[in-house]
């Protein structure tokens, strides 16, 4: 007996299109191997048609994939536009043809519906709109026009030229009759359920001479369209639902069990808890169409997805809808991450943000956050040299360490950091990933002066004290600017009594500026950091002002002014308070990604984000 | 409220025919998978057959103890679905479950992938 399972007969009818589901054992073993589907020949050999290796037989071409689900123990064969050849017996199987590892399928494709014994079919898809056409002769012209649903044995009346209308068609139902010249009235449905669907009759007359027009009404349940993304990764669901809705409310929702579709987000400003900081809406076009973003995927977003367009805002009967199965792939290529990183008022944190590291040379993003109406994320800071005026000194965003991973440095952090943050590229739209900063209580660890003012040609000394906790990490000092913040050489001048219990590891490491000029004058970081991993830092702002008094200056910590909340900018800095992630193709096509995506080398941060995925500060 | 009802159990003598049906009602939805299952006297409950609709296609699964002897059929459009068995042997006896599901996904044999469930129709094939 074969452990391969599957349905063992499928009909359908030309021009449609089946996914045929095989269900296998999900052994290691089995999970990795080639999955394929051949047609029996009457010889007893199986051709293959398509296959888990990337063969299309020229029979399929365009028309069909395989689509392996590793996690589920199943693949599926999607194959559209069917003809009438098509029909025979397959097989699907895993390994080669001939072993035995496999399961018999019977294709039976009929022929497609036209018109059927003078019956026009109708095709249409759930919440859409259908035309039914009923033509009529000019004796019936000035007669009543109605059209009846077969119910039963019996007509039932629907609609008619003298103003009655069903009560299960109120508000979405109307009967038109066409000028003079064409003898033709006719009935548009709107918001199709999929109760509408059976037999009509549309009549024009109530005599033995009336104009009588079958029809035969077939409403669909839109196809799932599988889509299937890593852990942790990001997905997009395009929503084309026709220019009229446009006006109509949107939304997405999850169906929970049964028919219940819980709402994910609307244009309502709906959005469920599940998703915050993690999902957006974008702005939709005029045709109506919109995207629904999620990133920092997770195990339990799997499931089945409706988009749809309602007034309330949420799925309703006649509902046009588009759907989706979202699988969640488990064996991820990208990497684990903190989920949450916690600093201190005043303090900073260093965020690591993966992307593919087949895209080094894409531009890199970070943006934050915003959950009013149907969410935005207005980028702060990029990797070409641009950063928003308002974290002007304390926003960096650095290449390091790379392969596969960027760092984003924010310090002087205060109460208003506290949100979630998106890491993103130009380049793989899969790979954006989320992170919330939480502020905690506690005092930074790194200790330096306020405002500093230094002036012109004297030298200048700022502290840094490092507690020593930091004993074993690489001390620096750096001079900020909007593409990183340039190293420069620092003096270790031994223990520093900055700490109470703290032994002779602590350390005082100084910045001195000689012969100060004005292009001194801007924000300096001192920091920690282990090889290409960087931790906590503390910024100083040096101000330069023409000379008073000779000497040089030594600042210490007492004498400091406290740093000031908002700095004035210059107002030469590119400012682009519009630059937001609201659309992804703002920065870059959907790209179909590869089956073979490089597994992920395990290369990340130092700080072991343990179970609960979460890093505190940036101290390790 | 939903409700799936089994009609169409009796006492067959062993190589006869019968025709199960399953009515669901209280659903605003077509259903997209209906299914049967067994269970005999002190056994699990098994998988028989299920029929799934998408689009304008049928999908039709069976346990291999029962292909070539039973055939599912249904309407979803009317929520019904039908199991025409043949050549019925002992080990066909049991409570017959007819199970269904808004949509079609997770392993049609497992309970798990279906919602709603009925009271059971009695089979009982004697020698």
């Known amino acids: 007996k074969s452990p391969i399972f599957g349905p063992e007969e499928v009909n359908s009818v030309e021009g449609n299109s089946v996914s045929i589901t095989c269900y296998y054992p999900p052994t290691s073993v089995n999970r990795h191997t080639r999955k394929y589907w051949c047609r029996q020949g009457a010889r007893g050999g199986c051709i293959t048609l398509i296959s888990s290796e990337g063969y299309v037989s020229s029979k399929y071409a365009g028309r069909a994939n395989l689509t392996n689900f590793p996690e589920n123990g199943t693949f599926v064969v999607n194959i559209a536009q069917l003809s009438q050849d098509d029909s025979g017996r397959y097989k699907c199987g895993l390994g080669i043809n001939s072993r035995g590892l496999s399961f018999d399928v019977s294709l039976e494709v009929s022929q497609g519906p036209g018109l059927l014994n003078d019956t026009k079919v109708y095709t249409v898809d759930l919440g859409r709109t259908v035309t039914i056409n009923c033509p009529f002769k000019t004796e019936n012209a000035q007669k009543r026009k109605s059209l009846y649903k077969q119910i039963g044995l019996y007509p039932v009346l629907v609609i008619d030229s003298s103003g009655y209308v069903n009560p299960n068609y109120t508000g979405r139902i109307r009967l038109d009759i066409q000028g003079t010249g064409q003898l033709l009235f006719s009935v548009v449905i709107n918001q199709l359920r999929l109760s509408d669907a059976g037999q009509y009759l549309c009549q024009a007359g109530d005599d033995s001479n009336s104009n009588k027009k079958n029809a035969d009404l077939q409403v669909l349940k839109p196809e799932p369209e599988l889509v299937y993304e890593d852990l942790r990764g990001s997905v997009t669901f395009h929503c084309a639902l026709g220019p009229e809705v446009a006006n109509v409310a949107k939304f997405l929702c999850r169906q929970s069990s049964g028919e219940n579709c819980d709402v994910v987000v609307n244009t309502l400003g709906k959005r469920a808890p599940a998703f915050e900081g993690r999902i957006l809406l974008n702005p939709q076009d005029k045709d109506g169409s919109f995207s629904v973003v999620i990133t920092g995927l997770r195990k339990e977003d799997a499931g089945r997805y409706l988009c749809g367009a309602h007034s309330d805002g949420q799925l309703q009967e006649g509902s046009p809808i588009q759907a989706w199965q979202l699988f969640v792939n488990e064996e991820s290529t990208i990497p684990r991450s903190p989920t949450v990183v916690k600093g201190v008022a005043g303090g900073s944190v260093a965020v690591l943000c993966p992307y593919n590291r087949k895209e080094s040379k894409s531009i890199k993003y970070w943006c934050l956050w915003e959950g009013a109406q149907n969410g935005r994320c207005p980028l702060l800071v990029d990797s070409e040299g641009w950063v928003k005026a308002q974290y002007e000194g304390r926003l960096s965003l650095l290449e390091e360490p790379g392969n596969g991973t960027f760092t984003v440095i924010l310090n002087q952090l205060t109460s208003r950091d506290a949100g979630f943050y998106w890491c993103l590229t130009n380049g793989d739209t899969l790979w954006r990933t989320t992170v919330e900063i939480k502020i905690i209580e506690g005092e930074p660890n790194l200790k330096v002066p306020g405002n500093v003012t230094a002036v012109l040609g004297e030298t200048l000394k700022v502290p840094c004290h490092f507690p020593c906790k930091f004993s074993s990490y690489e001390k620096y000092w750096c001079k900020w600017n909007n593409t990183g913040c340039q190293a420069l050489p620092s003096q270790d001048e031994g223990p520093s009594k900055a700490f109470v219990n703290c032994d002779e590891n602590s350390r005082l490491v100084s910045l001195t500026l000689n012969l100060v000029t004005r292009a001194d004058e801007g924000w300096y970081w001192c920091g920690v950091k282990q090889g290409h991993f960087y931790g906590e830092t503390a910024a100083v702002y040096v101000a330069v002002e023409e000379r008073k008094a000779a000497g040089s200056r030594d600042v210490s910590l007492a004498k400091a002014d406290a740093a000031p909340d908002e700095k004035v900018l210059d107002s030469g800095f590119r400012e682009i308070e519009n630059k937001a992630i609201q659309d992804p193709r703002l920065f870059a096509e959907e790209k179909a990604v590869a089956d073979t995506r490089d597994q992920a080398d395990g290369s990340r941060a130092s700080v072991d984000s343990g179970s609960s995925e979460e890093q505190g500060g940036s101290s390790r | 409220e939903v409700q799936l009802v089994e009609s169409g159990g009796g006492v067959v003598q062993a190589e006869d025919s019968l025709r199960l049906s399953c009515a669901a009602s209280?659903?605003?939805?077509?259903?997209?998978?209906m299914g049967w299952f067994r269970q005999a006297p002190g056994k699990e409950r098994e998988f028989v057959a299920t029929?799934?609709?998408?689009?304008?296609?049928?999908?039709?699964y069976y346990d291999d103890s029962v292909k070539g002897r039973f055939a599912v059929s249904g309407d979803n459009t009317k929520n019904t679905m039908n199991l025409q068995m043949k050549g019925l042997n002992l080990e066909d006896t049991g409570v017959y479950y007819c199970?269904?599901?808004?949509?079609?996904?997770?392993?049609?044999?497992?309970?798990?992938?279906?919602?709603?469930w009925g009271q059971g129709t009695q089979v009982t094939v004697s020698s």
């Open positions: 199970a269904a599901n808004p949509n079609n996904y997770g392993d049609p044999r497992t309970p798990g992938a279906y919602q709603y």
């Open positions: 209280g659903l605003s939805f077509s259903l997209s998978r």
């Open positions: 029929i799934e609709w998408s689009g304008r296609s049928t999908y039709k």
